[in-house]
Structures are given as structure tokens and as C-alpha cells.
């Protein structure tokens, strides 16, 4: 039975040109995390495999940095980066857990800075 839950930063906002950390955390399960996939809509951003390390999709390689941890740092944000992001945890023996983050990239400097994992 899958007992785990994914905690995410939920809805976050950041300024155009800035950076943001996308972070999820799997709790309430003893399952082993074998891999985390980061996706935006139907596009793969990155994969962090516990043994093989990181895969960064070529279309994002100049703007995505691995980490911290299993998270993903998105840099040089544009308004087009606004949207849903998914962390997909592959675990053994539970299976797959999915978390959702909504990122809004704001034009002005009045972006909220309250997000827990946001880079100053």
C-alpha cells in the first residue's frame, strides 16, 4: 500500500530574470527513492537517479542546474516559464508519487518572496 505523501512548495512566484528552486519532499513512507523526474507539462526538464546521477534535458541545459538535493534550480526565468511543474518520485517498493508546483513568473519587482525554497 502506498502510504507516502509529497510535500511541495505549492504555488510560488518569482521575478523575470531571477532564479527559483523547485523542491519536493516525500514523507510518511519507508520506500526507497530510486529516481526523481522533473517535468513541465509534457516536457522533461531533468532526472535525478540515485545511482546514475543527473540527466538535464538539452533544451534546458543552459537554464537548469541540478539540486540542491533532489530539487531543481531554474535560472534566467522568463514569463514563458509560468506554469505547472511536476516532481515524479520513483520509489521501491511503493511505485510512483507525483507532486505539483505552480510557478508564476512576474514582470515587475513586486513578486512575492515568501516561497520557502526561493533563492534570495
Amino acid at each position: 500500500m502506498m502510504t507516502g505523501t509529497i510535500e511541495t512548495t505549492g504555488n510560488i512566484s518569482a521575478e523575470k530574470g531571477g532564479s527559483i528552486i523547485l523542491q519536493c519532499h516525500l514523507s510518511s513512507t519507508t520506500a526507497q527513492v530510486t529516481q526523481v523526474n522533473w517535468e513541465q507539462q509534457d516536457q522533461l526538464l531533468a532526472i535525478c537517479n540515485a545511482d546514475l546521477g543527473w540527466h538535464i534535458s538539452p533544451s534546458f541545459k543552459d537554464r537548469v542546474a541540478p539540486g540542491p538535493g533532489l530539487g531543481l534550480t531554474l535560472q534566467s526565468l522568463t514569463v514563458n516559464d509560468t506554469g505547472e511543474y511536476f516532481c515524479i518520485y520513483h520509489t521501491y517498493p511503493d511505485g510512483t508519487y507525483t507532486g505539483r508546483i505552480f510557478l508564476e513568473v512576474l514582470e515587475s519587482s513586486v513578486a512575492e518572496h515568501g516561497a520557502r525554497f526561493q533563492i534570495p
Epitope: 517535468e39 522533461l44 540515485a50 545511482d51 546514475l52 546521477g53 540527466h55
Partner: antibody, heavy 119, light 107 residues
Amino acid sequence: EVQLVQSGAEVKKPGSSVKVSCKASGYTFTEHVIHWVRQAPGQGLEWMGGFNPNHDGTIYNQIFRGRVTITADKSTSTAYMELSSLRSEDTAVYYCARAAKLLFAMDYWGQGTTVTVSS
Amino acid sequence: DIQMTQSPSSLSASVGDRVTITCRASQHVSNAVVWYQQKPGKAPKLLIYSPSYRFTGVPSRFSGSGSGTDFTLTISSLQPEDFATYYCQQHYSTPWTFGGGTKVEIK
């Protein structure tokens, strides 16, 4: 120039083990994962597992159920794949391949090692 | 495990023909797909990754596309050196799996 040079052909008895080596050159060994892929005669490709020399992480295809062991000697930039409890169905060409940096794509391959399992 | 199904398993074509090979994943693999070319008695060679980026030195006549579960490798104008077997592979989740291959033969 990146090169992966594998050990020579082997003929083994059923129930025995084989250890294939893959010597890497032309790049920093610890910066790239090494994978092992096999191909039975006239068949397709089958991923066996990989080894990350950066932090000694090893991952296996569970279809081999503990029969495969992947190791490396970083001092000689050599990766090894050992397959135990051999059976006739393990007759195949075994390839090592390097993964590109920050990409799960195998960009350079060894020449292959033919392993024949026969009584 | 994710199954990768290639079609056709073989095809006959002439030099100059446009050739299309398809690969279907049994479940969502986003764009985590790679294509390899293999000639008889030789190791596979990386052609395309992610799934539309050509590897270094790969001619522009090779192109890849797709996302989700359906992927395509296209050779815009087949050359004599392109007669080979082509494999797709997914790396969305382990174990990594390959398609059964498509053999491109001379008509």
C-alpha cells in the same frame, strides 16, 4: 579521442561465471557513467546496468536477479561486468558504453565481447 | 517495465527515399528517448537524443521527434551508408529498455 576497449571473446560452461573488462581512455573516467548492454545472436539490445565512478553508485536490471555485478578500478580506468550462473541463453555480445555528461544517452561504445556458453 | 515497440521491424528502401521509423512506449516517457544505429558486427552508435538532438557528427538528414508515448526517427534522403538497424531506447525510468529494432534494407 574517447575509447572503450573490451577484453577478448570467452567460451564458458553452463553454471560458471564470466568477467568482461572495459578499459576507458581519452576522458576523465570518474566524470561519466559506464553502462553494460548485451545482444544475443540475431536479437535486440538489452540494458544490464550501470556504474557511476563518481560515487560508486551501481544500478542493475532486475531481470538478471543478482547474477550480474558491475565494478570498476578507477586507478586503471577500467570497468568490469561479471555474470554468474551462466546458461546457454547468456550467449551474446556484451558491450560497455559511456554515458554523456548530464545526459542519459550512451555516446561511446566498446567494440563488444562475445561470450559463448556451451557444454 | 516500460515496453518500447518499434515499427516496422524491417523495411526495404532505395537511396534517396524518405524513411520513417516509429517507436511507441507502453506508458508516458516524456521526451526521454534516444535513437541508435547499428551495422552488422559493429557496436551501436548514438544518433539522436531527447528526442530531437543530433549527436556530434550525425548528418542533418537524420531527425527525431515525439513526446509522451509516440516517437519518430526520420531519414530525409536515404544514403548507402544508412542501411543498418535502428533502435529506440527510453531512459524515463529504470530498467532502461530498447525497442526491438528496425532493419533498413536495400530495395
